[in-house]
Each structure stands twice: as C-alpha cells, then as structure tokens.
C-alpha cells in the first residue's frame, strides 16, 4: 500500500468549483496507478443557525479577497441619549441587568464568529502538513440599527442545522496530481480527501487519506431574493410582506432587511433567519394610512444581496364611525 499523497492544497477558482493539487506519496511501494478523491460539504456552525443577527448592532459581513483577515469595527455616529430629562445634562446611564447580559452575549457571539472565521480560513490540517493555501476573506463588522426586540439566540431547530453530515462523492483521478471538483455550492466549506493507489489497490486497498478543507468563492447574485415580494393587509394598521428565500445562497442567509416608507423608504425592519423560517415573511405594524413602498435585502455569510424591486402597498384609513369611536 502506498503512503498518503503529500502537500494537498486547494483553492477556489469559482463559486461552484475547487481546484485540488497534491504531490505523489513519498513511498509508492510499487507503480502508482491512480488517486481517489472524495469530497463532502461541511455543515455550518450550529451557532450561525441559532443566533439572532437582528439583535446585534454589529453583523459579520465577509468580503472575499486575497490576503489576511481584517476584523474591523465600523461605528455609527454616537446617539445622543438624554438621560436626565430635557433640563438635565447628558450623562452615562447606569447599566441595567439586561445590558450587562447583552454585553456578555456580545462577547460570546464575537468569540464564536471569530472561531468561524479562523476555521473557515486557516483550515485544520493533519499533523506536520503545510498550511492550506486558499483564498481568504477580509472581514468587516458593519454596523446598522436593528428595529427589533427578539432574543439573541433561538432554541427552535432549523432543519438544516439537524443535517450533521452531507452526502459524499467520489472520483478516480488517473495519472495526474490535480483535479477540479465541480457542482459545488457557493461560499461553502468542503472537506476533500485523497487516497493514493498503486497496482495492488484492488487486492490491498489504497493509502490512508490526506485531506484539506476549502471554501468555494461567493456567487454573484446568489443572495438576491428571487421572484416577487407580495403583501396582504392585516388588521390594526398592519400588513404582512412575503418573499421567497434565495435558493442557493452564499453559505446561508443570516437575516433580511426591509426598508419601507410612504414618502421615502426611511424606516427599517430586520427579520431574523428564524422568524423568516417560521412565518415566510414579516409583519409591519403601526402603519399610518397611506401608500407605501418597501424593498427587501438578504444578508448571507458572504455579504448582502441586492435590494428587491419595490413593492407597493397601502394602508386604508378607518372609515367614518370607526374613526369617530377611536
């Protein structure tokens, strides 16, 4: 049986392909005949499914580029908070228990996300192997206001999160130390195993495997919401917006942002992945009577999709007697 293939490297050249290269085993123990390449999609960190990204002032946005990781914090203009009423000077409010808890969760969130970055870029390797060379991501923490009261994490189980392991595929590579794996999902992590096989493979089997982890590049437009946004009137000056989720997103969709308004789209609503999975859309409440437009944008592991075309809807004024009694 030959020894394992050496120096396995993988890089992504597109959103659906990975190029894999390696060197022959140091001990072929006979005539080297072929290699077996196996690949398997890796599940996302469960935290990414459970975490409510709407509850944070900061959300991970990954920009795909060569180079090192750059975790940058972009802060908004400080909000002026009047703590002592109109007459009193502005002062630092004492932290509530809820705020202390939020800070603790923020630290946990940051730790998990940084682990995610580290594991998806600086990939784990077998002992004494060279580090994988692959394209990596610059990371920006982008800040935006979140109009939500949802909890930081959800206990509800996402069907995808239950998927502990995905099907694997195998291919035989003859007479070369390189292959291109196709038909992959965008911005998704794969484990690639390679066995070296010699003339006695049928009888004695091939080598143990050497492996590498690699992530495909993001796909342009993969996070765009397909198809139309629709709406339904609801009681109490509210409406329900529905939209289809991106079919094959970059990694997974973390949240959606709705911008809406009557004159200008100046109001924002954040819809977490978990809320969308539960309701298939979002309810906009406390709307004044009138005509509105709304647009929706998905945010995935690799960044933002495009805003949808505007959907036009209206909220009717309550008529006559109904208005009078209110």
């Amino acid at each position: 049986v030959p020894s394992i293939p050496l120096d396995v490297l993988s890089a992504s050249n597109s959103s659906s392909q990975l190029i894999v290269k390696w060197n022959p085993p140091s001990l072929p123990n006979g005539n080297l005949s072929y290699y077996i390449v196996r690949w398997q999609r890796q599940p996302q960190d469960g935290y990414l499914y459970r975490h409510n990204y709407c509850s944070k002032d900061k959300i991970p946005i990954r920009k795909y580029a060569d180079g090192t990781i750059d975790i940058e914090e972009v802060t908004e203009n400080p909000k002026t908070e009047v703590c002592g009423g109109e007459k009193g000077p502005c002062c630092a409010c004492p932290k509530t228990e809820a705020e202390k808890q939020a800070e603790k969760e923020e630290a946990e969130y940051r730790k998990v996300f940084e682990n995610f970055l580290h594991n998806s870029i600086f990939v784990p390797r077998p002992e004494r192997k060279r580090r994988d060379v692959m394209q990596v991501a610059n990371t920006t923490m982008s800040s935006r206001s979140r109009n939500t009261t949802a909890a930081d994490t959800y206990n509800i189980t996402d069907p995808e999160e239950l998927e502990t392991e995905y099907p694997f595929f195998e291919s035989r590579v003859d007479n070369k130390e390189r292959t291109v794996i196709s038909n992959l999902r965008p911005f998704t992590l794969y484990r690639i195993d390679i066995h070296s096989c010699n003339h006695e493979a049928e009888k004695l089997g091939c080598s143990a495997s050497n492996f590498v982890f690699a992530r495909t590049m993001p796909a342009e437009g993969a996070d765009d919401i397909p198809g139309p946004v629709t709406w339904e009137p609801r009681p109490e000056n509210s409406i329900f917006l529905k939209w289809p989720e991106p079919e094959n997103p970059n990694g997974l969709i973390l949240m959606y942002e709705i911008k809406y308004g009557s004159q200008v789209e100046d109001q924002r609503e954040c819809v977490s992945r978990q809320e969308y999975r539960k309701y298939g859309g979002a309810k906009l409440n406390r709307l004044n009577p009138g005509n509105y437009t709304a647009r929706i944008q998905a945010t995935s592991l690799s960044g933002n999709g495009s805003w949808t075309d505007p959907v036009f809807f209206y909220v009717q004024a309550k008529t006559g007697y109904e208005n009078f009694i209110h």
């Epitope: 196996r38 995905y166 099907p167 595929f169 195998e170 091939c206």
Partner: antibody, heavy 117, light 107 residues
C-alpha cells in the same frame, strides 16, 4: 472491471432476521463508500443506507432505522446489510451500489428478500 | 425529507420521438440530481449526474437540465432500447430520495 456480486436473499417470516452480502471486485473497495437501495415489487427505488469507506459513518432511511445495520469487512472486500425485525413491507429486491462524482455508478445484480408468513 | 415528483408517470412514444420527463423537488437541491434508466429485471443504470453531466458511455441523445427545484431529462430521438423506466434522485442531503419513476412505453 468493477463487479458487485450479491447474495443472502430469500424467504423469511415477519419478525426474523436476514443478512445480505455484496462482494466487490475490480476496484479498491476499502477506499470507497457504499450504499444499499431497495425496490419493492412493481414499485420505485428507495434508498436504504450508506457507509463511509472506513465504516466510521453510517446513515439510514427512517423506514429501516433501528432495525437494519450496514457494515463492511474491508479485508474481505464485502459489504453487508443485517436486517432484523423484518416486516412484510421490507419485501423488495435489494441492491448495493458505489457512489461516483454525482450518482450511483455501479450496482450489484440485486437479491430478492421476501417477508411472508 | 426532500420529495421528488416525476411527471408523467407513464409516457407512450414512438421511435424517433423527442421525449421530456420532468422532476420537481420539494425544496431547492442546487444541481444535486441524477437520472437513472431501469429495464425489467435489471439494476438501474446511471445516465446523468449533477443535473446535466452525461455519464461516461451514455449516448449523447440523453441530456439533463435544470437546477434548484425543476429538472428535465430529454431523449432527443427515442431508440428501441430506450423503452424503460426512468428515475430521478436527489443527492443534496440524507435521506437520499428517488422520484416515483416514469415508464416510457411503445406507442
């Protein structure tokens, strides 16, 4: 030439057990994942189970979970399906198959299992 | 579990006809779809994988297309040996599932 030769089928009573075998030749069996698929008489195909090349990972269809066990003996180049607590609805032709770059590229000839009282 | 709905279930056609079979997935499966041909008393044979890649040794009159939830298998000019049952299969996630089959019969 890749060959998957199946054996072990037969007629058994409900509640009993049976073990199917799939002997592989013509390829490096111990480096490949393997699947079982079944087909009830006059019906469509149903995936049953998968085992990784080294036997470390196994997955089953809900309909057989807890009753069937997929295993392999790499020294004998043989795949097995141990079927316990058999039911009438397990009556089918059972196939072993190898996985390729995107589908089951090699199949055994099939072996018929009939569960009847 | 992902359900695959094949249509039609039965199809009568003549030699030389262009035949199209569709397979609809209950949720998006990207391009993780394979097509098989099965003749009575025989094991299935892989025709197409990754939705559109022709398996080695399969005649070029067979072609596959689609991604996400809608897929088609097309036989451009039906030959006598093509009368058989055709199945689609999703390999996106466990449990792997098959469509109900389409039987192509001689008209």
């Amino acid at each position: 030439e890749v060959q998957l030769v199946q054996s072990g089928g037969g007629v058994v009573q409900p509640g009993t057990s049976l073990r199917l075998s799939c002997a592989a030749s013509g390829f490096s069996f111990r480096s490949h994942g393997m699947h079982w698929v079944r087909q009830a008489p006059g019906k469509g195909l149903e995936w049953v189970a998968v085992i990784s090349y080294d036997g470390s990972n196994k997955y089953y269809a809900d309909s057989v979970k807890g009753r069937f066990t997929i295993s392999r003996d790499n020294s004998k180049n043989t795949l097995y399906l141990q079927m316990n607590s058999l039911r009438a609805e397990d009556t089918a032709v059972y196939y072993c198959a190898t996985i390729g770059p995107g589908g089951f590229d090699y199949w055994g000839q099939g072996t018929l299992v009939t569960v009847s009282s | 579990d992902i359900q695959l709905t094949q249509s039609p279930s039965f199809l009568s056609a003549s030699v030389g006809d262009r035949v199209t079979i569709t397979c609809r997935a209950s949720q998006g499966i990207s391009s993780y779809l394979a097509w098989y041909q099965q003749k009575p008393g025989k094991a299935p044979k892989l025709l197409i994988y990754a939705a559109s890649t022709l398996q080695s040794g399969v005649p070029s009159r067979f072609s596959g297309s689609g991604s996400g939830t809608e897929f088609t298998l097309t036989i451009s000019s039906l030959q006598p040996e093509d009368f058989a049952t055709y199945y689609c299969q999703q390999l996106n996630s466990y449990p792997l599932t098959f469509g109900g089959g389409t039987k192509v019969e001689i008209k």
